[in-house]
């Protein structure tokens, strides 16, 4: 289900990534240099920026981030 509208709930931040708010609703997600071989699974639909640099992701499937707007 969708998370309730709130100013005190943190948007989903994938494990080990660093996240920070981007305005009222959005989230900047930094998952760089984590040795990832695939995309993080629990990305918030409110992600405005995603850094996957310095990882081991060799290929992306079509439409790899279906939850993102």
């Amino acid at each position: 289900g969708s998370s309730p509208r709130s100013g005190v709930l943190l948007r989903g931040c994938p494990t080990h990534c660093h996240c920070e708010p981007d305005g009222r609703m959005l989230l900047r997600v930094d998952c760089s240099d984590l040795g990832l071989s695939e995309l993080p699974s629990n990305l918030s639909v409110f992600t405005s920026y995603l850094d996957l640099s310095m990882n081991n992701i060799s290929q992306l499937l079509p439409n790899p981030l279906p939850s993102l707007r």
């Epitope: 509208r5 100013g7 005190v8 709930l9 943190l10 305005g23 959005l26």
Partner: antibody, heavy 117, light 107 residues
């Protein structure tokens, strides 16, 4: 700089109501939620509820549902917390605090509310 | 409601010590954890959000870690101004809930 200035200490009798104000300055009032949190003597922090000043949308802690009302006056950048049917367990310091995307970055100085017969 | 259990409730330490405070949630909170500092007569101060993100102006001796239900606040080398009470808070679901606090005192 961001400031949240709360109203002064209150002493109330059981069954009465109290209304605490929180005047915001140093930022755009309608861009941030306002949280209300209380702390009983020697205790931890307890969330009361929150209000979005842009349209007065509220979320309340079920524990206080029906007894608490959060409002804002955007013309004066002031938030209000009214708690009714006061009992001795409501004796606490009440804080307003602004939040954005899940964390509370500035807090008021607190308002002491004492409920005593 | 999610219960947040913080330990220890009080801690005596000396300037220069490394200090660790832990917070355990009653269910997985997916890294949605904040840490706050409270000093008598002063406004509560945000230290860390999203488990590990240092708020602006917070010294780098403070750090946060953890995952799932278990989270840690570490102060690498205690300074005199760090003696205070520390609270964790989960931002995973309503109502947000706080740990009981850890009072850090001078030994």
């Amino acid at each position: 700089q961001v400031q949240l200035v709360q109203s002064g200490a209150e002493v109330k009798k059981p069954g009465a109501s109290v209304k605490v104000s929180c005047k915001a300055s140093g930022y755009t009032f309608t861009n941030y939620w306002m949280q209300w949190v209380r702390q009983a003597p020697g205790q931890g922090l307890e969330w009361i509820g929150e209000i979005d000043p842009s349209d007065s949308y509220t979320n309340y802690n079920q524990k206080f549902q029906g007894r608490v009302t959060l409002t804002v006056d955007t013309s004066t950048s002031t938030a209000y917390m009214e708690l009714s049917s006061l009992r001795s367990e409501d004796t606490a310091v009440y804080y307003c605090a602004r939040s954005l995307s899940g964390y509370v970055d500035y807090w008021g100085q607190g308002t002491t509310v004492t409920v005593s017969s | 409601d999610i219960q947040m259990t913080q330990s220890p409730s009080s801690l005596s330490a000396s300037v220069g010590d490394r200090v660790t405070i832990t917070c355990r949630a009653s269910q997985d909170i997916s890294n949605r954890l904040n840490w706050y500092q409270q000093k008598p007569g002063k406004a509560v101060k945000l230290l860390i959000s999203y488990r590990s993100r240092l708020h602006s102006g917070v010294p780098s001796r403070f750090s946060g870690s953890g995952s799932g239900t278990d989270y840690t606040l570490t102060i690498s080398s205690l300074q005199p101004e760090d003696f205070a009470t520390y609270f964790c808070q989960q931002g995973n679901s309503l109502p947000p809930t706080f740990g009981g606090g850890t009072k850090l005192e001078i030994k």
